[in-house]
Amino acid sequence: LRPSRVHNSEENTMRALTLKDILNGTFSYKTFFPNWISGQEYLHQSADNNIVLYNIETGQSYTILSNRTMKSVNASNYGLSPDRQFVYLESDYSKLWRYSYTATYYIYDLSNGEFVRGNELPRPIQYLCWSPVGSKLAYVYQNNIYLKQRPGDPPFQITFNGRENKIFNGIPDWVYEEEMLATKYALWWSPNGKFLAYAEFNDTDIPVIAYSYYGDEQYPRTINIPYPKAGAKNPVVRIFIIDTTYPAYVGPQEVPVPAMIASSDYYFSWLTWVTDERVCLQWLKRVQNVSVLSICDFREDWQTWDCPKTQEHIEESRTGWAGGFFVSTPVFSYDAISYYKIFSDKDGYKHIHYIKDTVENAIQITSGKWEAINIFRVTQDSLFYSSNEFEEYPGRRNIYRISIGSYPPSKKCVTCHLRKERCQYYTASFSDYAKYYALVCYGPGIPISTLHDGRTDQEIKILEENKELENALKNIQLPKEEIKKLEVDEITLWYKMILPPQFDRSKKYPLLIQVYGGPCSQSVRSVFAVNWISYLASKEGMVIALVDGRGTAFQGDKLLYAVYRKLGVYEVEDQITAVRKFIEMGFIDEKRIAIWGWSYGGYVSSLALASGTGLFKCGIAVAPVSSWEYYASVYTERFMGLPTKDDNLEHYKNSTVMARAEYFRNVDYLLIHGTADDNVHFQNSAQIAKALVNAQVDFQAMWYSDQNHGLSGLSTNHLYTHMTHFLKQCFSLSD
């Protein structure tokens, strides 16, 4: 009896999560990613904001930049030049889109402990970076690229045609930033800093999305963004390379586009330097099932870049689009011509292949009914990658090492047995030559970051173990989480179920489905999170389920490409199927089932509510897409083709939320959107609202003035409070 009495008294001192806990970020965790500067050294910003250099081999650390210097210019970020002579300090951060921001930059000279005066950088700068060797600077100001040989030198202007919303040099336009490059920059230094490659995006002919930004003035401002929606005119991209040693000598040289790509609309997808005189460019047809990787060499005699047809490698998908979310990028071998790359094998699973002369002759390095996810590093004798192979759980990530310096190549899982219960989802960060690496474990237990020897894999030290978080959670009744699978009609539906702390299978609980469901996404992951749905389970006694249906990633092409050209069908069907299976489990109150989602999830939740199944009592859509004709070309056409009669217009029309307005009559619907959403335009929700009004269907709505797709800041608190009230009302839970 005693142990159970102790247990009960402990349980009495424990409390449920509150909404306040979530909104205050009380249970957020920290990760530690070393800022590697050599094989055995890294920089890190200490708790007191000093920039400290750590040497793993000597065990010594010293401050290279004091918090006083940081504070003197109000710096929120820094960057050390590779020759360790200068540091740039970044302040006045001003967010633009998902990755892009502008800032003011100051250069601090470490040799004399003073800021560089004379030829100061203009402000605000859109992007700035050091050369990989020495201390040259490249930066983008007012859509033009500038070069400095030394921080105190006058700048050399590389481009002159940059114009706001028209021509972008060295930075992407909106659609390339969000849907193709996933970066704020579009310039790349060669490994030793001899050349600088950059993209020029011409948005002159792109239609503009315009929306009001209300601000505090008498008249609202109009935000204009060149934004190609499905089927619209796209940016025209060109890639140039300039010799930074003698930039004025021949000027920027354009890199030729492969003929088979240039014959119709196309995209540039990524650039990878191989050596100072060899560069690899990846191109994609507008119909994104053909990708071409082109390896180009510098011709000293002509001072031009030559991309021979024999160095063009074509990747084509016959069952869907090329790649996963993006086409994978190559990791070059030390011979500077062959490379490793992830693409679908003959069985339809994404695996690492080694390509030398042709893609047809590729050697498959990994294989199995699982997927290789990322290649972290290739050295002379090892290849490090992540996959979801271990124990056949697609929502896990472990790090593997393949010994490629000997035959047969042997494979070792570096992380599988390190902290098996706590850590099942890893990423890694490697120093030069993979001498050392950091492992960052995201869960399912409390995240932990550790440092390891690159040769032996031995753990050297813990970098961050979130002790404070662990202590804070000691008296919290966290929900239980389980990850399992349903087998339905030859489809495996993995799900995560979040259960109230005192879950009792014999009782009935309200069910909330949280859905994203976008192509190549994954919601069912073995990661730690204390978030809104944790609170709903812990305090409000709800069961929450996340289901990865057709169209989701890392389980093979059959599941992934099932939604090709048919968005809005199977994703919704699979959520409904899962709900029916959950009801069969016996602990779900089938009169109290809700669904909610954000962005693509808002689209799926809307379609599920309007499916006419009678399964859902209520639901929420935050910033949903409502018609694929309203969304960005690069993303939408990848999965849907073009909205033209001879392509896929019919399904574009059939897959709108508006077409199902009548079906919302028997559900409680909460529609939410930010008016300054640059990504999924407010237009989407405006059209849903119009269709519902026209159909005389009652619904609830909330807009967030001047908020973008993230609904951040005070809007976040308001949003989650509002959604909580809505769900509690729907489920007849007392406030």
Epitope: P308, K356, I363
Partner: antibody, heavy 122, light 106 residues
């Protein structure tokens, strides 16, 4: 000591068949890429084809693809060359060669047998 | 890919330095090997990766080149160096050989 010993050569009539063997010893045969190379009298070397350690990849010179078959038996440490529909121009000294794995993913022909002579004549 | 070796033959004296060249019809990216074959014997690997000496090969042999042009240099010829030399690429199948260079004593 590494040894490659070819056998099975001899006189064969045009249109006939012959199977050459190459017995390996002194190294881990099952981890080596193996090749066949031939040398016509007074001429240079001609690469016939290769086989990787687990026989999953076999490549041939295009002109010989349809008449020669390369195989191996790792349990017996033996490499084979099945020659079909031979003609007088197939008269040559046939070498087997074994290669170290060289990163990244290719091999070199480090070890050679002494060769076996095939004469095609009626 | 066609490998063109030159010269087809050359005469040299002991102690001299000779260079044999090999031209590929396309870029073979240093995937090149050199072999020596003495009369009545099997070929022997000298160089791989265009410039790496195989185990046990004397340092008077050296390989160089890139792209489509490669060469084998023999410094201070020794009596045992006379014979035939072949280049072979390993870029893509078929791994063709050059026509050979016969090195004779002058």
């Amino acid at each position: 000591e590494v040894q490659l010993l070819e056998s099975g050569g001899g006189l064969v009539q045009p249109g006939g068949s012959l199977k050459l063997s190459c017995a390996a010893s002194g190294f881990d045969f099952s981890t080596y890429w193996m090749s066949w190379v031939r040398q016509a009298p007074g001429k240079g070397l001609e690469w016939i084809g290769e086989i990787n350690p687990d026989s999953s990849t076999i490549n041939y010179t295009p002109s010989l693809k349809d008449k020669f078959i390369i195989s191996r038996d790792n349990a017996k440490n033996t490499l084979y060359l099945q020659m079909n529909k031979v003609r007088s121009e197939d008269t040559a000294l046939y070498y087997c060669a074994g290669g170290y794995y060289r990163y990244p993913y290719y091999y070199t022909m480090d070890y050679w047998g002494q060769g076996t002579t095939v004469t095609v004549s009626s | 890919l066609v490998m063109t070796q030159s010269p087809a033959s050359l005469s040299a004296s002991v102690g001299e330095t000779v260079t044999i060249t090999c031209r590929a019809s396309g870029n073979i990216h240093n995937y090149l090997a050199w072999y020596q074959q003495k009369q009545g014997k099997s070929p022997q690997l000298l160089v791989y990766n265009a410039k790496t000496l195989a185990d046990g090969v004397p340092s008077r042999f050296s390989g160089s080149g890139s792209g489509t042009q490669y060469s084998l240099k023999i410094n201070s010829l020794q009596p045992e160096d006379f014979g035939s030399y072949y280049c072979q690429h390993f870029w893509s199948t078929p791994y063709t050989f050059g026509g050979g260079t016969k090195l004779e004593i002058k």
